[in-house]
């Protein structure tokens, strides 16, 4: 789970904050519902999901309910509400649409079984955010060496959909790996701004995967990786000249 | 009771630069959220930049019309908040609002920026 | 960037007079992230009321905001000497954070 952990029962006492949890203040099973992961794909809704082990074997819990709290000027709500949709973004989860969501104020959530809490947790939006998958993979030839042995290739994207990029809503910085189709272990590259990159010295006779993931500059974490591009560079004659294939 | 009080404002001329000070008593500093807000003489508020606490990895936002001129910062252990103010011009010139996340307010203190 | 036009930006009005100050957003804003300020002349600006409709501590209510979407409102219902100010909208929810450019009550 990414964000800062917090604990409900002393919001009231610094209510402009996020207040670090103690870690005395509650033990928390294994077998108990325990949130998994916050995200917000695009800095204007977010999703929350938790395990529901024990629902699965032979001790009931009760029904799971969230509830949050976000924190309103001068004081946090001192209602908590119960999650506005626990459908939308599938089992186990609670998704909050673009009206419930504000990268200005913080968020407590908390998980609770036949009124108990089991588990609580408090961020702030951009600390979730893991954009959605870049789309749209291709790649051109750019070169091929002299001895016809290696080549370079411009790999190109686009960002995910709904990220707004054009208004600077939201920066992305992407990160692309590649490796040949048989290894095990990716090469990558340094994380870049744009949504092209070369890619240099591939050797022709081999096919490559290349894949690309992106994360707000500054905040949040990578999302997930786009889908896989394969990447086959044909034979060339040795003899073939470096001028054709520009 | 909640008290922020500006200080560091003062006459300055174009391109140069100011350090404000913003010191904060009454409530848990080091949990809070603090922004600056400004406001041109005989005009309207404009927020200029915010910085969160540690919990939130002190995380800073600006406003487009300071970005990369202006910086933000903390100091928890003296319950300060700071604006550093560098390359001035002359639509930088203002009172300058220390506010709780824009909850409770600092009286302000004045930046001018003239040749 | 959310832009919020208040209307009108003088308001001349006499004590004991119902005032009604009138904010529009360029887009959507959630209820939950409007708040009004006032302001009197050389001081700070104070927070009136928070999330559309709810009194900061210690305004009296005669005070009430309301609203949705993109139009927001505040009422005085009955003018006091110390409510002539100028009151400023303002909005954190999608874009950075905004303020209204003011509507000034003054007596008539």
């Known amino acids: 789970f990414s964000g800062s952990e917090a604990t409900a029962a002393i919001l009231s006492r610094a209510p402009w904050s996020l207040q670090s949890v103690n870690p005395g203040l509650k033990t928390n099973s294994s077998k108990e519902p325990k949130f998994t992961k916050c995200r917000s794909p695009e800095r204007e809704t977010f999703s929350c999901h938790w395990t529901d082990e024990v629902h699965h074997g032979t001790k009931n819990l009760g029904p799971i309910q969230l509830f949050y709290t976000r924190r309103n000027t001068q004081e946090w709500t001192q209602e908590w509400k119960e999650c506005p949709d626990y459908v939308s973004a599938g089992e186990n989860s609670c998704y909050f649409n673009s009206s419930f969501t504000s990268i200005w104020i913080p968020y407590c959530i908390k998980l609770t079984s036949n009124g108990g809490t089991v588990d609580e947790k408090c961020f702030s939006v951009d600390e979730i955010v893991q954009p959605d998958p870049p789309i749209a993979l291709n790649w051109t030839l750019l070169n091929v060496s002299l001895t016809g042995i290696h080549a370079d290739i411009q790999v190109r994207w686009e960002a995910p959909r709904n990220a707004d990029i054009q208004k600077g809503w939201m920066v992305l910085e992407y990160e692309l790996q590649y490796k040949e189709v048989n290894e095990t272990k990716w090469k990558m590259m340094d994380p870049i701004l744009t949504t092209s990159v070369p890619v240099y010295s591939l050797k022709v006779d081999k096919e490559y995967e290349v894949r690309v993931r992106s994360k707000q500059r500054n905040s949040g974490n990578y999302g997930e990786f786009s889908e896989v591009l394969y990447v086959t560079l044909p034979q060339m004659s040795q003899f073939t000249c470096e001028e054709d294939f520009y | 009771e909640v008290q922020l009080v500006e200080s560091g404002g003062g006459l300055v001329k174009p391109g140069g630069s100011l350090r404000l000070s913003c010191a904060a008593s009454g409530f848990t500093f080091s949990d809070a959220w603090m922004d600056w807000v400004r406001q041109a003489p005989g005009k309207g508020l404009e927020w200029v930049a915010e910085?969160?606490?540690?919990?939130?990895?002190?995380?800073?936002y600006y406003a487009e019309s300071v970005k990369g001129r202006f910086t933000i910062s903390r100091d928890d252990s003296k319950n300060t908040l700071y604006l550093q103010m560098n390359s001035l011009k002359t639509e930088d010139t203002a009172v300058y609002y220390c506010?709780?996340?824009?909850?409770?307010w600092g009286q302000g203190t004045l930046v001018t920026v003239s040749s | 960037e959310i832009v919020l036009t208040q209307s009108p930006g003088t308001l001349s009005l006499s004590p004991g007079e119902r005032a009604t100050l009138s904010c529009t957003a360029t887009?959507?804003?959630s209820s939950w992230y409007l708040h009004w300020y006032q302001q009197k002349p050389g001081q700070a600006p104070r927070?009136?009321?928070?999330?559309?409709?709810n009194l900061a501590s210690g305004i009296p209510d005669r005070f009430s905001g309301s609203g949705s979407g993109t139009d927001f409102t505040l009422t005085i219902s009955r003018l006091e000497p110390e409510d002539f100010a100028v009151y400023y909208c303002h909005q954190y929810h999608r874009s950075t954070p905004t303020f209204g450019g003011g509507t000034k009550v003054e007596i008539k």
């Open positions: 927070l009136l009321i928070y999330s559309t409709s």
């Open positions: 910085i969160r606490s540690k919990a939130n990895y002190h995380a800073t």
């Open positions: 506010t709780l996340i824009r909850d409770y």
């Open positions: 887009s959507s804003v």
